[in-house]
C-alpha cells in the first residue's frame, strides 16, 4: 500500500475560490451580495473611474518595491564596527568653523578590512550618542560628495530629553558606495535643518565625541562612545558556499 | 472511538528545540558546533561585549515599532478623494509671493464629509502631479500649524524627468488631526529644500494646478489633476459592527 | 494581534504564540555560544478552523473569518507573523565573532 | 524567492505560489463587482519537508534548511509571503463605492 497522497489541484482551487467568496464578503461585512436593483444603467461615472484608477496606481507603485532576496537574508550576518576618525585628525581642520554642523570622517581602509567585499554588506548604520537636549531640534544628515559639496541623506526630529540616547541612521547605500569606490577618507555632516525663511540655524544637539573641556577620567568613555558605523555583512567564506539561485531546492 | 487528537505539547516543544538546533547551525553554515579548543580563558573582551550590546540595542529599537492592528487592517477601506481648494480662493492671497514654495489648502468640511469619524481614517495621501523637471530638486512638505508657522513633515529628492509623474506623500497623521480639531481651511506647503549655506532656493518643480497662462481646452484636465487628498477609511456602519478587540475569538 | 501580550495571558485554544525559552546549555547541550546564555524563541500552535463553504450561512462566519482564515487559504495554518533577530557571540578558533541571526524570536502568530 | 517569476515558470513540487485567476462572474456567479472583472488571486501549495532531527547528518541538510524550514517550525507550512491589495468598485443602492481590500493577491510563498 502506498502512503503517498496525490494533491487534487482542482479541489484545492475550488476550496480557495470558495474561501475568496467568504473573504470578500467578510472584508465588506456583507452577509450576502448587495442587491443590484437600484444600480443606474450605463457605464460607471468618470469621477468614480478616476478614483478607482488612483487607487490602482497606488497599488502598482507599492508592489514595485523589490523584495529582499530570502537566501541573502537567511544566513547570519557578521557584525563589526568602525569608529569615527578622531577629531584631532587634520581632515577636520577645514570644517571646524560652522555653528550649524558637525563632521564625522571614516577611514575607508578600516571599512574595507571589516567588509572586504562591498556586495556582502547587508546593513550599515551610523550610530551617534546624543547627550541632553533642552529644545526640540530638526537635524539633517549629509554625505561628503565631491570636493566641498554635500549630498542630503535623511533627517530626524529630535525631542528634548534629559538623558543620553543613541541615534541611528541607515547609511547602507552610502557605505557600499564608499567600499566600492571611496577615497581614503569619507565623511558625513550632521546639520541643523535650515528652513528657507528661518534665521537661527544653530545645531543645538550635543553629540558625544565633539564636546571639549572634558574631565580626564571621562575621556576614554567619551572616545569609545564617539560616532561609529555598525556594519552587518555576510562573511566571505559563507557567501562563496551559497548555492547558485538557479536551483532553489 | 473519539477522533479528537490531543496535542502533545512536550513533543511539539522538543521538535521545535531540535529544529532550532538545525536553524542556528544552518544560518552559520556550520555542519557541527565549532571546536572550543583554542578559546582563550576568561571573560569576553570589552570591545566584543560593546559590539554585542550595540547589536542587541538595535534589535530592541527595532521591535519597539508598533505593529498594525490586524482587525482594523482586515476590513475593506472606502476610498474617496478631496480636491485642493482652487487657487483663486482668497486664502491663497497672503501666500502668493514666494519663489521657494507653493501652497495647497483643503476644506475641512469636505474632509469630514468623506470621513465622518477621525478614528476611522486608515490612510491619507497627498497626491501631486509633477510636470517635466529639468534638474534634480530636493523638496520639503510642511503642514500649516498656527497663525503663520509651518511644521516640517517630510521630504523627497525628485530626479529629472521628461514625463509627468504622480507624487504621493503619506499625511495620515496630519489629516486625522485636521478631522479632529482643524479650522475651516487647513493646508500644506511644498518648498525647495534650503540648505544652511546655499543661495538658490527656488522651487523648480512644476506642480499641476499652479501654472498660469494655460490654454482654455486644457483647463478642465488641469483642474481635475490638481493636488488632492486620497483618503482610505473604514465606513462608519462597518466600524460599528467591529467586535471589541478584547475578545479575540 | 495574536502576540505575546495576548497569548501568554490567555488560555486561547486556537492559533496563538506559545512560550518557549531555549537554554543553549540545557536544551541543546551547547557551550560554544558565549552570549546570550539562552533566548525566548517561542512558537506558534493551535488550529485555524476552515470556516467557509457554500452551504455555511454567511452571516454566522463573517465575524470569525478575520481570525480563522483571513488570507482565504484552502488550508489555513498557524504561522509566525512578527519575528525578531538574535545577536550571538561565539569563537572561531581564538577569534570572537558577533553575528546576527535573522527571524529567531517569534513575537506573534497568524492564520495564513 | 518562491514568487510568481520563479514558480510560474518552473515545475516546482515543493512549496510555491500557484496561478489562480478569479473571474467574478464565472467563478463566483457575481455581477455586483463592477471593476475589476476579475483578478489574479493565486495561492500557496506544496510540501515543506521537515528536515531536522538529531540523527540526520548535519552537513546534508544545511543547504536545504533555508527553503524547507527557515523558521525552525515544529511543522512547517507553505503560506503567503508577499500579498497585495485589490481595489474594487460596487454599488450600495444607487451610490457607487470604491473600496480597497487588503492582502488579496498572493505574490510569493514561504515555508513557515
Amino acid at each position: 500500500l502506498s502512503t503517498c497522497k496525490t494533491i487534487d489541484m482542482e479541489l484545492v482551487k475550488r476550496k480557495r475560490i470558495e474561501a475568496i467568496r467568504g473573504q470578500i464578503l467578510s472584508k465588506l461585512r456583507l452577509a450576502s451580495p448587495p442587491s443590484q436593483g437600484e444600480v443606474p444603467p450605463g457605464p460607471l461615472p468618470e469621477a468614480v473611474l478616476a478614483l478607482y484608477n488612483s487607487t490602482r496606481d497606488r497599488v502598482a507603485g507599492e508592489s514595485a518595491e523589490p523584495e529582499p532576496e530570502p537566501e541573502a537574508d537567511y544566513y547570519a550576518k557578521e557584525v563589526t564596527r568602525v569608529l569615527m576618525v578622531e577629531t584631532h585628525n587634520e581632515i577636520y581642520d577645514k570644517f571646524k568653523q560652522s555653528t550649524h554642523s558637525i563632521y564625522m570622517f571614516f577611514n575607508t581602509s578600516e571599512l574595507r578590512e571589516a567588509v572586504p567585499e562591498p556586495v556582502l554588506l547587508s546593513r550599515a548604520e551610523l550610530r551617534l550618542l546624543r547627550l541632553k537636549l533642552k529644545v526640540e531640534q530638526h537635524v539633517e544628515l549629509y554625505q561628503k560628495y565631491s570636493n566641498n559639496s554635500w549630498r542630503y541623506l535623511s533627517n530626524r526630529l529630535l525631542a528634548p530629553s534629559d538623558s543620553p540616547e543613541w541615534l541611528s541612521f541607515d547609511v547602507t547605500g552610502v557605505v557600499r558606495q564608499w567600499l566600492s569606490r571611496g577615497g581614503e577618507i569619507e565623511g558625513f555632516r550632521l546639520s541643523a535643518h535650515c528652513s528657507c525663511d528661518s534665521r537661527d540655524n544653530t545645531l543645538q544637539v550635543d553629540i558625544n565625541g565633539f564636546t571639549t573641556g572634558r574631565r580626564g577620567d571621562l575621556a576614554t568613555i567619551h572616545g569609545m562612545n564617539r560616532p561609529f558605523l555598525l556594519l552587518m555583512a555576510t562573511p566571505l567564506e559563507r557567501a562563496q558556499h551559497l548555492q547558485s539561485s538557479r536551483h532553489r531546492r | 472511538l473519539s477522533t479528537c487528537k490531543t496535542i502533545d505539547m512536550e513533543l511539539v516543544k522538543r521538535k521545535r528545540i531540535e529544529a532550532i538546533r538545525g536553524q542556528i547551525l544552518s544560518k552559520l553554515r556550520l555542519a557541527s558546533p565549532p571546536s572550543q579548543g583554542e578559546v582563550p580563558p576568561g571573560p569576553l573582551p570589552e570591545a566584543v561585549l560593546a559590539l554585542y550590546n550595540s547589536t542587541r540595542d538595535r534589535v530592541a529599537g527595532e521591535s519597539a515599532e508598533p505593529e498594525p492592528e490586524p482587525e482594523a487592517d482586515y476590513y475593506a477601506k472606502e476610498v474617496t478623494r478631496v480636491l485642493m481648494v482652487e487657487t483663486h480662493n482668497e486664502i491663497y492671497d497672503k501666500f502668493k509671493q514666494s519663489t521657494h514654495s507653493i501652497y495647497m489648502f483643503f476644506n475641512t468640511s469636505e474632509l469630514r464629509e468623506a470621513v465622518p469619524e477621525p478614528v476611522l481614517l486608515s490612510r491619507a495621501e497627498l497626491r501631486l502631479l509633477r510636470l517635466k523637471l529639468k534638474v534634480e530638486q530636493h523638496v520639503e512638505l510642511y503642514q500649516k500649524y498656527s497663525n503663520n508657522s509651518w511644521r516640517y513633515l517630510s521630504n523627497r529628492l525628485l530626479a529629472p524627468s521628461d514625463s509627468p509623474e504622480w507624487l504621493s506623500f503619506d499625511v495620515t497623521g496630519v489629516v486625522r488631526q485636521w478631522l479632529s480639531r482643524g479650522g475651516e481651511i487647513e493646508g500644506f506647503r511644498l518648498s525647495a529644500h534650503c540648505s544652511c549655506d546655499s543661495r538658490d532656493n527656488t522651487l523648480q518643480v512644476d506642480i499641476n494646478g499652479f501654472t498660469t497662462g494655460r490654454r482654455g481646452d486644457l483647463a478642465t484636465i488641469h483642474g481635475m489633476n490638481r493636488p488632492f487628498l486620497l483618503l482610505m477609511a473604514t465606513p462608519l456602519e462597518r466600524a460599528q459592527h467591529l467586535q471589541s478587540s478584547r475578545h479575540r475569538r | 494581534a495574536l502576540d505575546t501580550n495576548y497569548c501568554f495571558s490567555s488560555t486561547e485554544k486556537n492559533c496563538c504564540v506559545r512560550q518557549l525559552y531555549i537554554d543553549f546549555r540545557k536544551d541543546l547541550g551547547w557551550k560554544w555560544i558565549h552570549e546570550p546564555k539562552g533566548y525566548h524563541a517561542n512558537f506558534c500552535l493551535g488550529p485555524c478552523p476552515y470556516i467557509w463553504s457554500l452551504d455555511t450561512q454567511y452571516s454566522k462566519v463573517l465575524a470569525l473569518y478575520n481570525q480563522h482564515n483571513p488570507g482565504a487559504s484552502a488550508a489555513p495554518c498557524c504561522v509566525p507573523q512578527a519575528l525578531e533577530p538574535l545577536p550571538i557571540v561565539y569563537y572561531v578558533g581564538r577569534k570572537p565573532k558577533v553575528e546576527q541571526l535573522s527571524n529567531m524570536i517569534v513575537r506573534s502568530c497568524k492564520c495564513s | 524567492a518562491l514568487d510568481t517569476n520563479y514558480c510560474f515558470s518552473s515545475t516546482e513540487k515543493n512549496c510555491c505560489v500557484r496561478q489562480l485567476y478569479i473571474d467574478f462572474r464565472k467563478d463566483l456567479g457575481w455581477k455586483w463587482i463592477h471593476e475589476p472583472k476579475g483578478y489574479h488571486a493565486n495561492f500557496c501549495l506544496g510540501p515543506c519537508p521537515y528536515i531536522w532531527s538529531l540523527d540526520t547528518q548535519y552537513s546534508k541538510v544545511l543547504a536545504l534548511y533555508n527553503q524547507h524550514n527557515p523558521g525552525a517550525s515544529a511543522a512547517p507550512c507553505c503560506v503567503p509571503q508577499a500579498l497585495e491589495p485589490l481595489p474594487i468598485v460596487y454599488y450600495v443602492g444607487r451610490k457607487p463605492k470604491v473600496e480597497q481590500l487588503s492582502n488579496m493577491i498572493v505574490r510569493s510563498c514561504k515555508c513557515s
Epitope: 529582499p68 532576496e69 537566501e71 541573502a72 537574508d73 575607508t108 574595507r112 572586504p116 567585499e117 562591498p118 556586495v119 556582502l120 547587508s122 567600499l179 566600492s180 569606490r181 571611496g182 577615497g183 581614503e184 555576510t234 557567501a239 551559497l242 547558485s244 539561485s245 538557479r246 | - | - | -
Partner: antibody, heavy 120, light 111 residues
Framework: QVQLVQSGAEVKKPGASVKVSCKAS????????MHWVKQAPGQGLEWIGN????????NYNEKFKSKATLTVDKSTSTAYMELRSLRSDDTAVYYC?????????????WGQGTLVTVSS | DIVLTQSPDSLAVSLGERATINCRAS??????????IQWFQQKPGQPPKLLIY???NLETGVPDRFSGSGSRTDFTLTISSLQAEDVAVYYC?????????FGGGTKVEIK
C-alpha cells in the same frame, strides 16, 4: 577627478612585442584592480585579464594566457600590458578599465584606448 | 565560463519610443541578492561608458531614461524614450566569475 590615460597608437610587425601603458590619477592606485579589454575592428569586447596593483596578483582569460602579461609600477601609478608574438588578429583597440573595489567590482572608469596595428 | 547572450543584435526605434535590450546568462550571476551585471554604451571611436551597475543601479550622471532590471539569469536594459544621442552599441558584462565575459552587443539605431 579619476582618470586613466593610455599610451599612443602602435604599429608592429608580426612576431614582435608591444607594451601598452595606462597611467592612473585622481584615486589611490593600489586600492582597485585594473582590467584590460580587447576590441578588434568592428567586433565586440573581450576581457583579457586583471591585476591587483597592491600585490601584483593577476587573473587571465585562458585565451590570452600565452599572449598577455600584466604588470604595474606603483611608484608612477601605471599599469602595463605586454603583448608578445604579435599576429594580424591581435590588431585591435586595447582598453584599461578600473574596477570598483572587491572581487566583483564593476568597470566605472575606462582609458581612451590604444590602437595596436600588426602589419607586415 | 559564463556565456552572456544579448538580443536582438540590432534594433531600430523611432525617436521618443522605448528600446529594450535583453541579456541572458548561462548561469546565475547573483551573489547574496546582488545581480552582478553591468550595461555599457559605446559610440564609435570612444571607450565604453558605464550606464548601469548591479543590474539596476543608474550610474551618476546617466539620464534617467536608462533603466536596468532582472535577476539571476535574465536582464534587461530599457531606454524609455530614445533620443538621437542614444544611437550606439550596448553591451552587458558579468562580474560574478573570472573570466569576466561580455554580451555580443546590440546596435541601436533610429528608425
Amino acid at each position: 577627478q579619476v582618470q586613466l590615460v593610455q599610451s599612443g597608437a602602435e604599429v608592429k610587425k608580426p612576431g614582435a612585442s608591444v607594451k601598452v601603458s595606462c597611467k592612473a590619477s585622481g584615486y589611490t592606485f593600489t586600492s582597485y584592480w585594473m582590467h584590460w579589454v580587447k576590441q578588434a575592428p568592428g567586433q565586440g569586447l573581450e576581457w583579457i585579464g586583471n591585476i591587483n596593483p597592491s600585490n601584483g596578483d593577476t587573473n587571465y582569460n585562458e585565451k590570452f594566457k600565452s599572449k598577455a602579461t600584466l604588470t604595474v609600477d606603483k611608484s608612477t601609478s601605471t599599469a602595463y600590458m605586454e603583448l608578445r608574438s604579435l599576429r594580424s588578429d591581435d590588431t585591435a583597440v586595447y582598453y584599461c578599465a578600473r574596477a570598483t573595489y572587491g572581487s566583483y567590482g564593476y568597470f566605472d572608469v575606462w582609458g581612451q584606448g590604444t590602437l595596436v596595428t600588426v602589419s607586415s | 565560463d559564463i556565456v552572456l547572450t544579448q538580443s536582438p543584435d540590432s534594433l531600430a526605434v523611432s525617436l521618443g519610443e522605448r528600446a529594450t535590450i535583453n541579456c541572458r546568462a548561462s548561469e546565475s550571476v547573483t551573489i547574496i541578492g546582488t545581480n552582478l551585471i553591468q550595461w555599457f554604451q559605446q559610440k564609435p571611436g570612444q571607450p565604453p561608458k558605464l550606464l548601469i551597475y548591479h543590474a539596476s543601479n543608474l550610474e551618476t550622471g546617466v539620464p534617467d531614461r536608462f533603466s536596468g532590471s532582472g535577476s539571476r539569469t535574465d536582464f534587461t536594459l530599457t531606454i524609455s524614450s530614445l533620443q538621437a544621442e542614444d544611437v550606439a552599441v550596448y553591451y552587458c558584462l558579468q562580474s560574478r566569475q573570472i573570466p569576466r565575459t561580455f554580451g555580443g552587443g546590440t546596435k541601436v539605431e533610429i528608425k
